[in-house]
């Protein structure tokens, strides 16, 4: 439905508070280096303009598209050329090319200082002094560091952030109340950002069809009682929402997400029995709750798929008439029967089925050709099952930190050209699969583990895309979205890699390591481990373990010493020499 003024339409639909918050997120995700105050000024100007359009939709410029209005506003920033370099060239383009240009310059790893959490009293004072500015600053800082964060979900995080401060700043022990809540929000926020980044990568790198296939599989697992037509409608609407958010159209995205939540709740009887509680919540909580809702129970009786998808005389006829609909039905029917499979496995099975039909429907005897298609699924199903079983056993044996170290070594040997910080970050996240998924019963392990690994490997892919250094990473990241994990799993030690020159500076440590948190100290040790493997890629597990044990003992000893700095200097030299000898450097 066309509106005379798009900006007035969205302002009225969303309300002033959400409108301002979403415009701030949009601007911060585009201009990630701009100071907070500059963004607030731009947002206020856009909001005042929107109000004039609400009052009179025929007023000057009110008929312009949101991209035109927002792009024009961003291009008024005086320091654009100095701060962003070639991104300033975007402003010479017309819409829609200008917006595409801004999107291409989004930086997944912006050069921004780490967010340091102030003292609780300082935060509470700031919160009480100016609640609005405090919450805007939260939106700004998250959005600029996570330029693909799902904007309507960030509003939900901000609401929880506000609730935490409202409650805890009045508590007797403010820190005990607030810090765990902030830790939880931080961890959930990182996970939410990474999940959304995969959705955007799926849309942008592999297209709408790939995203829709993912959505059919996931929604069919979640809503197995819903009919195919219902699932298809939800997939279409969900695709529109995520296309908008990934494209920077945050106002439309938030508006359409609210409409989708409304539709789901109005039609929950034909969608899922698990939605009742979600649908009683306010809008932001409702949308979040629906997105996380548990899988509904499967219908009591479902037939084998063989009749419709293998035995029927009409398989090739049905396929030829509407390929994507027929494959969509196959995926829907398979996924609703298998909540125990990962989405990516279901997509691999559907791809195998599609490939078989493409080949067989052109053969002399199609039925004879595709009769055993389900047998081809067996190795595809068993590969992730076996991998998860092996890795969960390893995790249970080693614990999270040592399991992460095993993955650090494994992945550094596979792709040693990747930067050390990226290898550490990705391997640490890969290692978290153990505590996240191995505790689950068998039926929940694969969807938990393999779909989580898809999210983490996408982080590697987007970070690597910014500065490509490894053909093997590029190949695994770009060839097939659903086969990324098997592609990385199949990589062996890179025999072409020329070991890095030994640099004693890399292994020089100081007393400041003693004051770091346990997590930070682990990262320091894991950084050293990656560097060791880069120097000596053929080092055995035993050799690396011996050096790491010596390193841990060295840190512990020097942190207990009276003169810590001298200890680190003297013992450090001995450790480097001993490590070189142990590894034959």
């Amino acid at each position: 439905d066309a509106h005379k003024s798009e900006v007035a339409h969205r302002f009225k639909d969303l309300g002033e508070e959400n409108f301002k918050a979403l415009v701030l997120i949009a601007f911060a995700q585009y201009l990630q280096q701009c100071p907070f105050e500059d963004h607030v000024k731009l947002v206020n100007e856009v909001t005042e303009f929107a109000k004039t359009c609400v009052a009179d939709e025929s007023a000057e410029n009110c008929d312009k598209s949101l991209h035109t209005l927002f792009g024009d506003k961003l291009c008024t920033v005086a320091t654009l050329r100095e701060t962003y370099g070639e991104m300033a060239d975007c402003c010479a383009k017309q819409e829609p090319e200008r917006n595409e240009c801004f999107l291409q310059h989004k930086d997944d790893n912006p050069n921004l200082p780490r967010l340091v959490r102030p003292e609780v009293d300082v935060m509470c004072t700031a919160f009480h002094d100016n609640e609005e500015t405090f919450l805007k600053k939260y939106l700004y800082e998250i959005a600029r560091r996570h330029p693909y964060f799902y904007a309507p979900e960030l509003l939900f995080f901000a609401k929880r952030y506000k609730a935490a401060f409202t409650e805890c700043c009045q508590a007797a022990d403010k820190a005990a109340c607030l810090l765990p809540k902030l830790d939880e929000l931080r961890d959930e926020g990182k996970a939410s950002s990474a999940k959304q980044r995969l959705k955007c990568a799926s849309l942008q790198k592999f297209g709408e069809r790939a995203f829709k296939a993912w959505a059919v599989a996931r929604l069919s697992q979640r809503f197995p009682k819903a009919e195919f037509a219902e699932v298809s409608k939800l997939v279409t609407d969900l695709t529109k929402v995520h296309t908008e958010c990934c494209h920077g159209d945050l106002l439309e995205c938030a508006d359409d997400r609210a409409d989708l939540a409304k539709y789901i709740c109005e039609n929950q009887d034909s969608i899922s029995s698990k939605l009742k509680e979600c649908c009683e919540k306010p809008l932001l909580e409702k949308s979040h709750c629906i997105a996380e809702v548990e899988n509904d129970e499967m219908p009591a009786d479902l037939p084998s798929l063989a009749a419709d998808f293998v035995e029927s005389k009409d398989v090739c006829k049905n396929y030829a008439e509407a390929k994507d609909v027929f494959l969509g039905m196959f995926l829907y029917e398979y996924a609703r029967r298998h909540p125990d499979y990962s989405v990516v496995l279901l997509l691999r099975l559907a791809k195998t089925y599609e490939t078989t039909l493409e080949k067989c429907c052109a053969a002399a005897d199609p039925h004879e050709c595709y009769a055993k298609v389900f047998d081809e699924f067996k190795p595809l199903v068993e590969e992730p099952q076996n991998l998860i079983k092996q890795n969960c056993e390893l995790f249970e044996q080693l614990g999270e930190y040592k399991f992460q170290n095993a993955l650090l070594v494994r992945y550094t040997k596979k792709v040693p050209q990747v930067s050390t910080p990226t290898l550490v970050e990705v391997s640490r996240n890969l290692g978290k699969v153990g505590s996240k998924c191995c505790k689950h019963p068998e039926a929940k392990r694969m969807p938990c583990a393999e779909d989580y690994l898809s999210v983490v490997l996408n982080q590697l892919c987007v970070l690597h895309e910014k500065t490509p250094v490894s053909d093997r990473v590029t190949k695994c990241c770009t060839e097939s979205l659903v086969n990324r994990r098997p592609c990385f799993s199949a990589l062996e030690v890179d025999e072409t890699y020329v070991p890095k020159e030994f640099n004693a500076e890399t292994f020089t440590f100081h007393a400041d390591i003693c004051t770091l948190s346990e997590k930070e100290r682990q990262i320091k040790k894991q950084t050293a481990l990656v560097e060791l493997v880069k120097h000596k890629p053929k080092a055995t597990k035993e050799q690396l373990k011996a050096v790491m044990d010596d390193f841990a003992a060295f840190v512990e000893k020097c942190c207990k010493a009276d003169d810590k700095e001298t200890c680190f200097a003297e013992e450090g030299k001995k450790l480097v020499a001993a490590s070189q000898a142990a590894l034959g450097l």
Partner: nanobody, 123 residues
């Protein structure tokens, strides 16, 4: 501990009948699709027939259609395989299996397996 115990196997003349039973314990029987598989000497294990959780849907391999019938009694936690018009090529070790989730009835979807019961059809 989940246990599937098959019984009812034996030696029978071609054209004769047998009824196999599989008693399940240690699982919520009505939450599992059940299947019968067989393995003849020197051959791969093959699916014979499977039945959905509520018993409303069945799936038969072409080689046994019209001769074999699967049924289940959820109150008794038992699945049955009635085999009529038996042929020498039906000679095999017959396994009962349970699947929490099933789409194709293929072997890889089944979580639990019995030890098997031998059926020998002599000509």
């Amino acid at each position: 501990e989940v246990q599937l115990v098959e019984s009812g196997g034996g030696v029978v003349q071609a054209g004769g009948s047998l009824r196999l039973s599989c008693a399940a314990s240690g699982l919520t029987f009505s939450s599992y699709a059940m299947g019968w598989f067989r393995q003849a000497p020197g051959k791969e294990r093959e699916r014979v027939v499977s039945i959905s959780r509520g018993g409303g849907y069945t799936y038969y391999a072409d080689s046994v259609k019209g001769r074999f019938t699967i049924s289940r009694d959820n109150a008794e936690n038992t699945v049955y395989l009635q085999m009529n018009s038996l042929k020498p090529e039906d000679t095999a070790l017959y396994y009962c299996a349970a699947a929490r989730y099933w789409a194709t009835g293929s072997e890889y979807e089944f979580d639990y397996w019995g030890q098997g019961t031998l059926v020998k059809v002599s000509s």
